[in-house]
Amino acid sequence: MRRGPRSLRGRDAPAPTPCVPAECFDLLVRHCVACGLLRTPRPKPAGASSPAPRTALQPQESVGAGAGEAALPLPGLL
């Protein structure tokens, strides 16, 4: 079940999510949580026409969770 090229997938559709409806993948803890538990979006920079992307600022190696600083709120899809 090989998926199509990554670049096309990224351009044509939002990132897939492994979560059930009403839950979102939290990049801070790296599992699905109720979407309402996610951190609020960062304020968008002055002059920006779209919200600043929410990405994880996570170290490349870790022995514990909690090192990230943001969450990506992608609600579960049916």
Epitope: T17, E23, R30, V33, G66
Partner: antibody, heavy 118, light 107 residues
Framework: QVTLKESGPGILQPSQTLSLTCSFS??????????VGWIRQPSGKGLEWLAH???????YYNPALKSRLTISKDTSKNQVFLKIANVDTADTATYYC??????????WGQGTALTVSS | DIQMTQSPSSLSASLGERVSLTCRAS??????LNWLQQEPDGTIRRLIY???RLDSGVPKRFSGSRSGSEYSLTISSLESEDFVDYYC?????????FGGGTKLEIE
């Protein structure tokens, strides 16, 4: 259909480095929120989580073993690797890899046995 | 690290009986708990995710629940293939940790 399969040397001598490969199909580690991890089980004992790696190359290690562990991936080949340095008889176990999604480990490999013996 | 204390370590029961296995978490893990089943040949499969959600293909006689820091796997009516090993796994925080396992044996 998601499948994972572990491969390893089977037997090592103490102080050698263990190299394990997890080959998988049915998903891609370039997909958002996908991860692959390693777990081991000494014969007759319980399961122990070792390490896992996420689609974005973020890695987590068991603190008790971190100094000896290295996890990596080859996304294009659908493979994840684990190296354990300086093995000892206490590392004799069956080693499993598993897929991680949003709710822990959802698919598991069949396991590969390792014996460390001089 | 979060400790998962699983009980009992072994359990003898009869066909058709209702049994419950429990795991107690040493810290708050919310609903981030799996129940896993391991066959004698080593095959592992997930039965329950997020404390109480049944994986596809898992018989309805399996169910999961939570009361505070205690998590339970209940099998409503034991069948012959259920007499294997069971583990809980918390994935709330790294390092992920397992319960010590329960060996379910036929009486």
């Amino acid at each position: 259909q998601v499948t994972l399969k572990e491969s390893g040397p089977g037997i090592l001598q103490p102080s050698q480095t263990l190299s394990l490969t997890c080959s998988f199909s049915g998903f891609s580690l370039s997909t958002f929120a996908m991860g692959v991890g390693w777990i081991r089980q000494p014969s007759g004992k319980g399961l122990e989580w070792l390490a896992h790696i996420w689609w974005d190359d973020v890695k987590y290690y068991n603190p008790a073993l971190k100094s000896r562990l290295t996890i990596s991936k080859d996304t294009s080949k659908n493979q994840v690797f684990l190296k354990i340095a300086n093995v000892d008889t206490a590392d004799t176990a069956t080693y499993y890899c598993g897929r991680i999604g949003g709710y822990g480990f959802d698919y598991w490999g069949q396991g590969t046995a390792l014996t460390v013996s001089s | 690290d979060i400790q998962m204390t699983q009980s009992p370590s072994s359990l003898s029961a009869s066909l058709g009986e209702r049994v419950s296995l429990t795991c107690r978490a040493s810290q708050d893990i919310g609903s981030s708990l799996n129940w896993l089943q391991q066959e004698p040949d080593g095959t592992i499969r997930r039965l329950i995710y997020a404390t109480s959600r049944l994986d596809s293909g898992v018989p309805k006689r399996f169910s999961g629940s939570r009361s505070g820091s205690e998590y339970s796997l209940t099998i409503s009516s034991l069948e012959s293939e259920d007499f294997v090993d069971y583990y809980c796994l918390q994935y709330a925080n790294s390092p992920y940790t397992f319960g010590g396992g329960t060996k379910l044996e036929i009486e």
